[in-house]
């Protein structure tokens, strides 16, 4: 079941998730002067079963001059650095991760994909919160959101945190040092 | 909460045009598309197009195109629809929708009538 | 363009029955199709999504299924609530298509 709104907004921080239950639907958007091409889904879907989950569908963006241009899926090297450092690093550990039933880990990136990733997220959904770089963390409490149903609709919890002053981004679970388990979730970005 | 709150009902004349609105609410405007969606009694629904407010990108249904014109307005995140020339087979209810259709807006009555 | 077709305009039930409600569409959509119920007087409220994803409060007597071309909305132990037009959309492509719809009556 799809939760009815997007996750609540924290001043000077970002969300992400680090698995992504299925039925979650990530937006099919281009950069500035690309769009969806026209025959084909305007989002990806995670979908499966409890032993397998994947992404179905795939987004392609096409030249907004050169209507009828189709760009390939695959990304080349240029495309790649446009995304963050942090999302970067976590498309090369995808391959080294156990995967969580029932969730789709964080999609390769798509050529000319805007910068921002719009996900609609399901029930149960965990997304988790850091403070933007020159900003240190106030926690009273979990830096994490949950949808959840309540009384036939849906809300996200409220995350304990406050981003002030100046000092190092705090860090995601499973980050905090190089010796965690090994078979910790790979870290994937949603910015905000 | 979500919510898509359309203008009131419109009574026009043929050959005239019309431009309806649609106010969203509670969440992130520039991030999804905005749709259009017809409906007359007896056609079932027809998808006129849809605009991304965010790039100001647009999509029209050819049987729409010169017809319907699709802009927002980022500042107040308000879509809105131009209908021009019309006749009687553009009196309809026009619904605005977003977030992937997953909510609508209660809809505009647009009646051409001389 | 992709037709979508409703080939049943009335559907008569019971309370309590199991319904299924057809659509077929003119070319592979995959799973990329979406439910709507309609009420007199009311706009169109999504029930599902990708042919088979509910949307939330809707209720599991709400079953979507199908792929490729042909799909079917179940709607088991049907309400008085129920009684309504449902109307099915396939967004595998532009322009996005609707069903005729199909109208949900009390034998």
């Known amino acids: 079941e799809l939760c009815d709104d997007d996750p609540p907004k924290i001043t000077h921080a970002t969300f992400k998730a680090v698995a992504y239950k299925e039925g979650t639907m990530l937006n099919c958007e281009c950069k500035r002067g690309f769009r969806r091409i026209k025959s084909g889904s305007p989002y990806m879907l995670c979908t499966g079963n409890s032993s397998h989950s994947s992404w179905d569908n795939q987004c392609q963006c096409t030249s907004s001059a050169a209507r009828n241009t189709t760009k390939q899926v695959t990304p080349q090297p240029e495309e790649q650095k446009e995304r963050k450092t942090t999302e970067m690093q976590s498309q090369m550990q995808l391959a080294d991760q156990v995967s969580l039933p029932g969730h789709c880990r964080e999609p390769p990136p798509w050529e000319n994909e805007a910068t921002e990733r719009i996900y609609h997220f399901v029930v149960g959904q965990t997304v988790y919160y850091q403070c933007v770089q020159g900003y240190r963390a106030l926690h009273r409490g979990p830096a994490e959101s949950v949808c959840k149903m309540t009384h036939g609709k849906t809300r996200w919890t409220q995350p304990q945190l406050i981003c002030t002053g100046e000092t190092e981004p705090s860090q995601f679970p499973g980050e905090e040092e190089p010796q965690a388990s090994p078979d910790g979730l790979p870290e994937s970005e949603t910015s905000r | 909460d979500v919510q898509l709150q359309q203008s009131g009902a419109e009574l026009v004349r043929p050959g005239t045009s019309v431009k309806m609105s649609c106010k969203a609410a509670?969440?992130?405007?520039?991030?999804?598309?905005i749709g259009w969606v017809k409906q007359r009694p007896g056609h079932g629904l027809e998808w006129i197009g849809d605009?991304?407010?965010?790039?100001?990108?647009?999509n029209y249904n050819e049987k729409f195109k010169g017809k319907a014109t699709l802009t927002a307005d980022t500042s107040s995140s308000t879509a809105y629809m131009q209908l021009s020339s019309l006749t009687s087979e553009g009196s309809a209810i026009y619904y605005c929708?977003?977030?992937?259709?997953?909510?609508w807006g209660q809809g505009t009555l647009v009646t051409v009538s001389a | 363009d992709t037709t979508v077709t409703q080939s049943q305009k009335f559907m008569s039930t019971s309370v309590g029955d199991r319904v299924s409600v057809t659509c077929k569409a003119s070319?592979?959509?995959?799973?990329?199709v979406a439910w709507y119920q309609q009420k007199p007087g009311q706009s169109p409220k999504a029930l599902i999504y990708?042919?088979?994803y509910r949307y939330s409060g809707v209720p599991d007597r709400f079953t979507g299924s199908g792929s490729g071309t042909d799909f079917t909305l179940t709607i088991s132990n049907v309400q008085s609530e129920d009684l309504a037009e449902y109307f099915c959309?396939?967004?595998?492509?532009?322009?996005?298509?609707f069903g005729g719809g199909t109208k949900l009556e009390m034998k």
């Open positions: 929708t977003s977030r992937n259709f997953a909510y």
């Open positions: 509670g969440y992130t405007f520039t991030n999804y598309w």
């Open positions: 605009i991304h407010p965010g790039g100001g990108y647009t």
């Open positions: 990708s042919a088979s």
């Open positions: 070319q592979n959509v995959g799973t990329n």
């Open positions: 959309q396939q967004y595998n492509s532009y322009p996005y298509t």
